[in-house]
């Protein structure tokens, strides 16, 4: 069951082409850009979408302090280069021969070099931290039914398995979210911590990646929360390596 | 050998309450979510509640209003249901079940149950 | 929320026949579905999860298959252990949920 097989379409990506030209007839679908075939009965890989986006036509106390060497994503949208298997090559260029390595989530974790500059390894990002803030309300949200909500969102919607949402926390207004899955931990078939992670941030801007289900519609013990701004921060195992003058 | 056993059940006047309990044995608790389920004699299975004991989340369906509480005591393998307000209606033989461990939420491992009459 | 409804309630078969129980929700729920058997004075057994895939230890003789909305459980070659109600369950979301189990179908078997 890779795709809906009655109008063949891909429930869990809208950017995606589908026919029924698989093995018997089956229901098919190709993600826009590279044209890899894609499980639609799981997430798509953050690489595959930036793919297919960049192909697409142009038209306090208690909370986590992330650690020096937390990473945003400050560089924006650009053309990936994916392995087979959709994930990022280590490795990324532009067209105009300028180059960097990048994590799992394809955060850029070096200075930009030429096309001399070596990348290694793909080095995991194992801990992701989403920050929240929400739209005012009459009262907090009770802090216990705000983390179960946010895993079952996690768990049902995104396929993020409880054990991988280490925690949440919550100081009126802002909450944040604790992603943690080492390369140890994940087994064949989980999602992606990286995945999730961007398919919540899409949900957030209203732009949901999912075909034909609702726009993402959290609530708490009834109370709708809206969310007015997010920022994320990416740890990988292995701390990213910037020049000193990025720093200053 | 994996294995769930309730105890706890009995006969109740309405309006009283029960503590139902669920000892888990040959895995470990906080990799499952688990559940309780009833059956009303001669009836079909009706889902109670679920907690995920690793972060003591709880969810319940929308008809417990409040009724019943579940939790767990993690060291102790242990599940637990309390009923309150009870009536005859929830004359039943109370299930916990566990998952399966993976992001959907199939039963594959179920307690022999325990039989609660609420009577006068 | 997702509601669950089974037919039919009660089915009679002969021993070495096929039977085939259908499960209808009320909302896609791709193949977040699973079956299970009840035989009485016992508690439920999973046969089925993800729709289509045999929990362990279960005979090839039941099958599940569907996707979205739309279910069955087929035995075949039934045999006189094989009496028993069975019941479809949603195992998609526990948000908002009144019961994921169907009412449950009734196999006799002759």
């Known amino acids: 069951h890779t795709a809906a097989q009655d109008n063949c379409t891909c429930p869990t990506n809208k950017m995606t082409v589908c026919s029924p030209d698989g093995p018997g007839g089956r229901c098919q679908c190709r993600a826009l850009g590279s044209g890899v075939a894609v499980d639609c009965s799981t997430l798509t890989s953050k690489c595959l979408l930036l793919k297919a986006r960049m192909s697409a036509p142009k038209n306090a106390r208690t909370l986590v302090r992330p650690n020096e060497h937390a990473l945003v994503d400050n560089d924006g949208l650009y053309d990936p280069d994916c392995d087979p298997e959709g994930r990022f090559k280590a490795r990324q260029c532009n067209q105009t021969s300028v180059c960097w390595c990048v994590n799992s989530v394809g955060v850029r974790r070096t200075d930009k070099g030429d096309l001399s500059l070596r990348c290694d390894e793909l080095v995991r990002t194992h801990h992701i931290l989403i920050d929240l803030r929400h739209r005012p309300t009459a009262s907090a949200f009770n802090h216990s039914d705000l983390d179960a909500e946010l895993r079952r969102l996690f768990r049902e919607r995104y396929r993020l398995h409880p054990k991988f949402v280490a925690a949440v926390h919550y100081e009126q207004p802002t909450i944040q979210i604790e992603l943690r899955q080492n390369t140890s931990q994940k087994a064949a078939g989980d999602v992606d911590i990286g995945d999730a992670a961007y398919y919540f941030e899409r949900d957030v801007k209203g732009e949901s990646l999912f075909q034909g289900r609702g726009g993402l519609d959290l609530r708490v013990r009834g109370e709708p929360l809206q969310v007015e701004r997010t920022l994320i921060y990416y740890l990988d195992e292995i701390p990213p390596k910037f020049s000193m003058k990025r720093l200053t | 050998q994996e294995q769930l056993k309730e105890s706890g059940g009995g006969l109740v006047q309405p309006g009283g309450s029960l503590k139902l309990s669920c000892k888990a044995s040959?895995?470990?608790?906080?990799?499952?979510?688990v559940s309780w389920v009833r059956q009303a004699p001669g009836k079909g299975l009706e889902w109670i509640a679920y907690?995920?004991?690793?972060?003591?989340?709880?969810y319940y369906a929308t008809w417990v209003n409040g009724r019943f509480t579940i939790s767990s005591h993690n060291a102790q393998n242990t599940l637990y249901l309390q009923l309150n307000s009870l009536t005859a209606a929830d004359t039943a033989t109370y299930f916990c079940?566990?998952?399966?461990?993976?992001?959907?939420?199939?039963?594959?491992?179920w307690g022999p149950g325990t039989l609660v009459t609420v009577s006068s | 929320d997702v509601v669950m409804t089974q037919t039919p309630a009660s089915v009679e078969v002969a021993v070495g026949g096929t039977v085939t129980i259908k499960c209808q929700a009320s909302k896609n729920i791709d193949s977040n579905l699973a079956w299970y058997q009840q035989k009485p004075g016992q508690p439920p057994k999973q046969l089925i999860y993800a729709a289509s895939t045999l929990a362990s230890g279960v005979s090839s003789r039941f099958s599940g298959s569907g996707y979205g909305a739309e279910f069955t459980l087929t035995i075949s070659g039934v045999e006189c252990a094989d009496a028993a109600t069975y019941y479809c369950q949603q195992a998609l979301t526990i948000g908002n949920v009144d019961n994921p189990f169907g009412g449950g179908s009734e196999v006799v078997v002759k």
């Open positions: 079940a566990r998952d399966a461990g993976s992001v959907d939420y199939n039963f594959n491992l």
């Open positions: 040959g895995f470990d608790f906080n990799n499952y979510g």
């Open positions: 907690i995920y004991p690793a972060f003591h989340n709880t």
